[in-house]
Interface confidence: low
């Protein structure tokens, strides 16, 4: 199921608003963490500080761990470095759409989306295009709401991410995440 159409309202972990709020917090934290590891001061990333609850902190730690693993995947880094940032909107949505084009949803692909967004943001920082940062975050959250929200609701909310990556084989899953993103970037390069 995709995220199209009307979604139930309310404050529970599977409500549209709660999933989007948590997603925004996770994405913001993930991007800030990646930028911090580059050692760069990024006032553009000084977005609204929102206190995270214990569950969101666990999720953030999980994402950080996966991000570290993906950072060490040289093939993936090489492909991301080759991304043409002259048309970031088109690149983002082609890659994002391709990641989910077969209709199969899993947490690995959701994380891959976050990771790709973070890399585009870091490129924007490096190339001194700070106004792109919020925009890229927005594209990611727009995509999340409009394509992935229904599926995340079906998983019981973001906590499903912890059980997916909470297994002893999470490194294997991370390799799969890198594969998904590499494949999408390859297709984009061919189409582009």
């Amino acid at each position: 199921m995709d995220g199209s159409g009307e979604q139930p309202r309310g404050g529970g972990p599977t409500s549209s608003e709660q999933i989007m709020k948590t997603g925004a917090l996770l994405l913001q934290g993930f991007i800030q963490d990646r930028a911090g590891r580059m050692g760069g001061e990024a006032p553009e990333l000084a977005l609204d500080p929102v206190p995270q609850d214990a569950s969101t902190k666990k999720l953030s730690e999980c994402l950080k761990r996966i991000g570290d693993e993906l950072d060490s995947n040289m093939e993936l880094q090489r492909m991301i470095a080759a991304v043409d940032t002259d048309s970031p909107r088109e690149v983002f949505f082609r890659v994002a759409a391709d990641m989910f084009s077969d209709g199969n949803f899993n947490w690995g692909r959701v994380v891959a989306l976050f990771y790709f967004a973070s890399k585009l943001v870091l490129k924007a920082l490096c190339t001194k295009v700070p106004e792109l940062i919020r925009t890229i975050m927005g594209w990611t959250l727009d995509f999340l709401r409009e394509r992935l929200l229904g599926w995340i609701q079906d998983q019981g909310g973001w906590d499903g991410l912890l059980s997916y990556f909470g297994t002893p084989t999470w490194q294997t899953v991370t390799i799969f995440v890198a594969g998904v993103l590499t494949a999408s970037l390859t297709i984009w390069k061919k189409m582009g």
Epitope: G3, T135, D142, R145
Partner: antibody, heavy 119, light 109 residues
């Protein structure tokens, strides 16, 4: 150069139908959220509907839900607004617009097309 | 739905004046607010996005700021071509519909 050109407006009786078109050029509609915004005579701006072609997502204002349908033909780079069961209060200039993403606002607007619902 | 309460609804000012228009969001919208200028018979034009970023080609006398859920559009020195109606708009990412303020008409004193 980015351009949005609306067409299809006109005079229609209450209960009637109209289909508005928005021909986009200078960008790929497949990767943009397209919106219809209307403005009744002498009034403010009211968001009507949006479509994101890359993930087949549509959304509507409560005032038009069930009566209006937004769609897009990416091969023609054109967005549409099918308006059924029209009411007098739907009388307005209808603008087609491109939304630039979170916080980015609407960066390009068409010139607008007038829809008049009257008997 | 998130409401955007814009004030004043109209104001009279002279060329060279500093003009301030305010919008208050009914709940947090982070910085996802844009400002537009509209002249009679014309489509709106984007001035400010993400609360405080000046859109390409817009004169630097226009600026936007945010304090919590209050958003301000400032014209530092009003020019003859600035007499128009101004609208704020929110596009917070987990809130459809997009909503506009009621508009502020800036008239010549």
């Amino acid at each position: 150069e980015v351009q949005l050109v609306e067409s299809g407006g006109g005079l229609v009786q209450p209960g009637g139908s109209l289909r508005l078109s928005c021909a986009a050029s200078g960008f790929n509609l497949s990767y943009s959220s397209m919106h219809w915004v209307r403005q009744a005579p002498g009034k403010g701006l009211e968001w009507v509907a949006s479509i994101s072609s890359y993930y087949s997502y549509t959304s509507y204002a409560d005032s038009v839900k069930g009566r209006f349908t937004i769609s897009a033909d990416t091969s023609k780079n054109t967005a549409y607004l099918q308006m059924n069961s029209l009411r007098a209060e739907d009388t307005a200039v209808y603008y087609c617009a491109r939304y630039y993403g979170y916080g980015g606002g609407i960066d390009y607007w068409g010139q607008g097309t007038l829809v008049t619902v009257s008997s | 739905d998130i409401q955007m309460t814009q004030s004043p609804s109209s104001l009279s000012a002279s060329v060279g004046d500093r003009v301030t228009i305010t919008c208050r969001a009914s709940q947090s919208v982070s910085s996802a607010v844009a400002w537009y200028q509209q002249k009679p018979g014309k489509a709106p034009k984007l001035l400010i996005y993400s609360a405080s970023s000046l859109y390409s080609g817009v004169p630097s006398r226009f600026s936007g700021s945010r304090s919590g859920t209050d958003f301000t559009l400032t014209i530092s020195s009003l020019q003859p071509e600035d007499f128009a109606t101004y609208y704020c708009q929110q596009s917070w990412y987990y809130s459809y519909p997009i909503t506009f303020g009621q508009g502020t008409k800036v008239e010549i004193k």
